[in-house]
Structure formats: structure tokens, C-alpha cells
């Protein structure tokens, strides 16, 4: 038997993946545990094996189909259970009725690239990955730029309140190395959260022309 506080959190990537994290204080060490997904209106069930990510938390991805397939809709409810093996039996450790479009976390934006760079500005574009067509244009983005001598945490957040997959960074210093990241969030969903940050894109502004400021 396990005592202690249990927390079971899952997010839907809007297409074919539900990622779950289960935390348990009275940690189970060598027990095999699974997340089991049981949709209310679909003919499939899905399990994934929870793997340890820290001393008292486990994670897994319920892969519901091909990455860009639309496996769930706004009306679906999926019963999610954590089941752990106790001898030959399985014990339910946590359970939730999961509304996928109330618990969204998209994949990090991909394909970041510098479109145009000058001495003081840089135009950057990106793409969203595995995002449902249901959102249409109802997405927002946050971006941040890492300047020399600073940390990501110190970088000011730039907010794009619409589906705009590019940004023009201004007032940059000439001949300087920067890094850029972006993340995305649907406007839909009570418990929806930001995607992970994209992989950083490194770029360098052009040097100022001698005797002239561009």
C-alpha cells in the first residue's frame, strides 16, 4: 500500500498525444505503473508505461495515433487512470475524467529561422507543430531574446496576441550574438498552459558600417 499525496497531471497536444506526470510522496520504487486511457465515445483504449523522471514522479506519453491525426475533439472525455502492479493484481492509484480541450499544451514551435538580419534588427519566423485545425487562428505566442551577459529568466517577454508566426526584433546592438526562443498557447481551455520553449535560435547582428550607423 502507498500513503502520501498523489498528483496526476495530463495535457493534450491537440492532435494525438496526451502527456502525463504522476507524483507520489510515498514513492514506489520498483513497481510497474501504467497510465490507462479510456475514452467515453471511442472504440480504442491506450496505455503507456510510467517511467521515473525524479525520486517521486513518473511520466509517459499516450500516443493515440500518427502525429498529425486528430484523435480527440472538444466533446470527448477520457478517463485516465494510474494503475500500479501489486503482485499479480493492479491497483488504481489515481483517476481523472480528462477533457482534452480544457487541458491543452501544444508542442514547442519548430523550424525557427532568420528571415533577414541587419545591424539593429532581425526578422525571425517559425512554425507550429502538430496543432489542431480546430484552433483556426486562435493562438497566442510569447517570445524572448537572450542578450550577452544575461540569463533567459532575465529576458523580457514579448507577447503576440494573435497567430503570427514571425517577429521583427528591434533596437539590437550591432555585431552581437543573440539567441531567440518562442512558445505557443491556444486561447481555448480552462487549464491550458504554454508549450515548452522552442529550441534556441542563435543569430548575430551585422556590424555597423564604418563612419555610418545603419
Amino acid at each position: 500500500a502507498v500513503n502520501g499525496t498523489s498528483q496526476f497531471t495530463c495535457f493534450y497536444n491537440s492532435r494525438a498525444n496526451i502527456s502525463c506526470v504522476w507524483s507520489q510522496d510515498g514513492a514506489l520504487q520498483d513497481t510497474s505503473c501504467q497510465v490507462h486511457a479510456w475514452p467515453d465515445r471511442r472504440r480504442w483504449n491506450q496505455t503507456c508505461e510510467l517511467l521515473p523522471v525524479s525520486q517521486a514522479s513518473w511520466a509517459c506519453n499516450l500516443i493515440l495515433g500518427a502525429p498529425d491525426s486528430q484523435k480527440l475533439t472538444t466533446v470527448d472525455i477520457v478517463t485516465l487512470r494510474v494503475l500500479c502492479r501489486e503482485g499479480v493484481r493492479w491497483r488504481v492509484m489515481a483517476i481523472q475524467d480528462f477533457k482534452p480541450f480544457e487541458n491543452l499544451r501544444l508542442m514547442a514551435p519548430i523550424s525557427l529561422q532568420v528571415v533577414h538580419v541587419e545591424t539593429h534588427r532581425c526578422n525571425i519566423s517559425w512554425e507550429i507543430s502538430q496543432a489542431s485545425h480546430y484552433f483556426e487562428r486562435h493562438l497566442e505566442f510569447e517570445a524572448r531574446t537572450l542578450s550577452p551577459g544575461h540569463t533567459w529568466e532575465e529576458a523580457p517577454l514579448l507577447t503576440l496576441k494573435q497567430k503570427q508566426e514571425w517577429i521583427c526584433l528591434e533596437t539590437l546592438t550591432p555585431d552581437t550574438q543573440y539567441e531567440f526562443q518562442v512558445r505557443v498557447k491556444p486561447l481555448q481551455g480552462e487549464f491550458t498552459t504554454w508549450s515548452p520553449w522552442s529550441q534556441p535560435l542563435a543569430f548575430r547582428t551585422k556590424p555597423a558600417a564604418l563612419g555610418k550607423d545603419t
Epitope: 483504449n45 496505455t47 508505461e49 495515433g65
Partner: nanobody, 123 residues
């Protein structure tokens, strides 16, 4: 839906070894818990072994514990069954099975099946 093709069967003497392979195609392999079953002439299909999506947890039928090892390579979309110390009673057609639900993998009617590969153990 996933399609499964078994290979590696054959004739082997008692005490020998064989390695069966099951190649999967047509769907995302890591969605599936994979299993091996076998069916001897005139007998019902019998659970042999299973392996979870990550490959971390395995399960075995009582008759093969300690002799057979199931594993998977998610990069190659393949599941394996290493069979050591084979006995004449291991003679059967060996089937690969797939199910998205770990808790249904022993259920004969819920699985997707391969065509099977014959294993014959002579004494």
C-alpha cells in the same frame, strides 16, 4: 492499424536456441504493447510473453519463465523472442500480437495478429 510479420522459426534440437523477430508497420509502433503467443496442434493459443511500450516491463507465461526473453527495438519497429533451452513441448506456431492497451494484451480477441512462424523442437 499495425501489420505484423514474424520470422526466425525453424527446426532445432532439444536444448538449442532460436530467436524470433516480429516486424511491425502501418502505425506508430510505440503505441503498442507487444506479445508473443503460441499454438500447438490441437491446443488453444497460449500466452508466451509480453513487453510494454517502453520495453521496461516484461511478462511471461509460466511454462517459459527463465528460458525465453522478450525485448523490443522501437527504432527498428521490431519485437524479439529469444528462446533458449528449447523443449519438444515448445513445438508450435508462434504468433506476434499487438494491442494499444496493456491490460488487454492477454485477451485473444482484442489483439492484432501476425501470420505466425513455425517452431519445431526435435528430441
Amino acid at each position: 492499424e499495425v501489420q505484423l510479420v514474424e520470422s526466425g522459426g525453424g527446426l532445432v534440437q532439444a536444448g538449442g536456441s532460436l530467436r524470433l523477430s516480429c516486424a511491425a508497420s502501418g502505425d506508430v509502433f510505440v503505441r503498442y504493447t507487444m506479445a508473443w503467443f503460441r499454438q500447438a496442434p490441437g491446443k488453444e493459443r497460449e500466452f508466451v510473453a509480453s513487453v510494454t511500450d517502453s520495453g521496461r516491463t516484461t511478462d511471461y507465461g509460466d511454462s517459459v519463465k527463465g528460458r525465453f526473453t522478450v525485448s523490443r527495438d522501437n527504432a527498428k519497429n521490431t519485437v524479439y523472442l529469444q528462446m533458449n533451452n528449447l523443449k519438444p513441448e515448445d513445438t508450435a506456431v508462434y504468433y506476434c500480437a499487438a494491442n494499444t492497451d496493456y491490460f488487454q494484451i492477454r485477451s485473444l480477441d482484442a489483439n492484432t495478429w501476425g501470420q505466425g512462424t513455425q517452431v519445431t523442437v526435435s528430441s
